[in-house]
Interface confidence: medium
């Protein structure tokens, strides 16, 4: 399963490459929501390019919200340290690309796309509309961008 190297310009202290997000929700602003609980959560800050702590109110908000720093990093950061050291980067697929197609337990039958590790391609499947896993994309394009070579 060989992957092509992706070219990157050399990064200096004053120059950062264009930010490539794994998920569009990583670009959402931290949203504490309208409720008044005090819950420690983490979000990806597109300006600092790091996962940071914020206080979540306990309801609503958005998907840029993680229970742990590790989960935030896994979902929203690529290995920027490697980018600084190397001019080329062997880009790895996120772990969830290797999860099996998962329709969940509901009966909604929504068309979604998943990465099929057998065929090494993104394919259409019917999602039930709830639960399931992260190998689940609204568009073929998004699936290809994230999971295909």
């Amino acid at each position: 399963d060989s992957e092509e190297d992706e070219e990157h310009t050399i990064i200096t202290d004053t120059e950062l490459p264009p930010l490539k997000l794994m998920h569009s929700f990583c670009a959402f602003k931290a949203d504490d929501g309208p409720c008044k609980a005090i819950m420690k959560r983490f979000f990806f800050n597109i300006f600092t390019r790091q996962c940071e702590e914020f206080i979540y109110g306990g309801c609503e908000g958005n998907q840029n919200r993680f229970e742990s720093l590790e989960e935030c990093k896994k979902m929203c950061t690529r290995d920027n340290a490697n980018r600084i050291i190397k001019t080329t980067l062997q880009q790895e697929k996120p772990d969830f690309c290797f999860l099996e197609e998962d329709p969940g337990i509901c009966r909604g039958y929504i068309t979604r796309y998943f990465y099929n590790n057998q065929t090494k391609q993104c394919e259409r499947f019917k999602y039930g509309g709830c639960l399931g896993n992260m190998n689940n994309f609204e568009t073929l394009e998004e699936c290809k961008n994230i999971c295909e070579d």
């Epitope: 908000g61 099996e100 998962d102 337990i105 509901c106 009966r107 509309g129 709830c130 639960l131 399931g132």
Partner: antibody, heavy 118, light 112 residues
Framework: EVQLVESGGGLVQPGGSLRLSCAAS????????MSWVRQAPGKGLEWVSA????????YYADSVKGRFTISRDNSKNTLYLQMNSLRAEDTAVYYC???????????WGQGTLVTVSS | QSVLTQPPSLSGAPGQRVTISCTGS?????????VQWYQQLPGTAPKLLIF???NRPSGVPDRFSGSRSGTSASLAITGLQAEDEANYYC????????????FGGGTKLTVL
């Protein structure tokens, strides 16, 4: 007639473990996702965990993630919930239910009481 | 605090019409997820009353009906009867990051 019968509840100390079972009959067990839903004394309903018909996919509420494990044996028409590191707040009646139409639970068992107390 | 909000209690006289509300947010009912309603008689397991917003399983009287609009849903009971005295729960799915099946806190319906 669809029947779901839970067993395995009882009194356990904080930090202890219990394994609940749910024996199913009257429907094609392997064709249905199954869930555990609990109800603390005098409180409302709380979804705990779910498992797909094949057993290949499992799902958990945040409150039990890492402590509870759902599984099923389709050859025995039985659903299980292994509960570890139990806490006082896990005290509840635990119901098993089958996922039918939409996101609904069509049929429920009679429940089994789990009490976590020292 | 439940993800879906219901009035804790309601009451009505026999023969009356009562409506139980269920208010959610943009990540559950407002995201077009179906709502279900369950009836729990004292000392018994919950029973499915309405699924997919407004569908009744066989055996449920047509006195019970459901609807959903935006971030709210409601259960209407017409021709209230003594045996309708129970707790009623709405339930849906919430797509927030750790998505899960969610319930309302329940409404205790008393038939006067």
């Amino acid at each position: 007639e669809v029947q779901l019968v839970e067993s395995g509840g009882g009194l356990v100390q904080p930090g202890g473990s219990l394994r609940l079972s749910c024996a199913a009959s009257g429907f094609t067990f392997s064709s249905y996702a199954m869930s555990w839903v609990r109800q603390a004394p005098g409180k409302g309903l709380e979804w705990v965990s779910a498992i797909s018909g094949s057993g290949g996919s499992t799902y958990y509420a945040d409150s039990v993630k890492g402590r509870f494990t759902i599984s099923r044996d389709n050859s025995k028409n039985t659903l299980y919930l292994q509960m570890n590191s139990l806490r006082a707040e896990d005290t509840a009646v635990y119901y098993c239910a089958n996922n039918g139409a939409a996101a609904a639970w069509d049929y429920w068992g009679q429940g089994t009481l789990v009490t976590v107390s020292s | 605090q439940s993800v879906l909000t219901q009035p804790p209690s309601l009451s009505g006289a026999p023969g009356q019409r009562v409506t139980i509300s269920c208010t959610g947010s943009s990540s559950n009912l407002g995201a077009d997820y179906d709502v279900q309603w369950y009836q729990q008689l004292p000392g018994t397991a919950p029973k499915l009353l309405i699924f997919g917003n407004n569908n009744r399983p066989s055996g449920v009287p047509d006195r019970f009906s459901g609807s959903r609009s935006g971030t709210s849903a409601s259960l209407a009971i017409t021709g209230l009867q003594a045996e309708d005295e129970a707790n009623y729960y709405c339930q849906s799915y919430d797509r927030s990051l750790s998505g899960s099946m969610v319930f309302g806190g329940g409404t205790k319906l008393t038939v006067l």
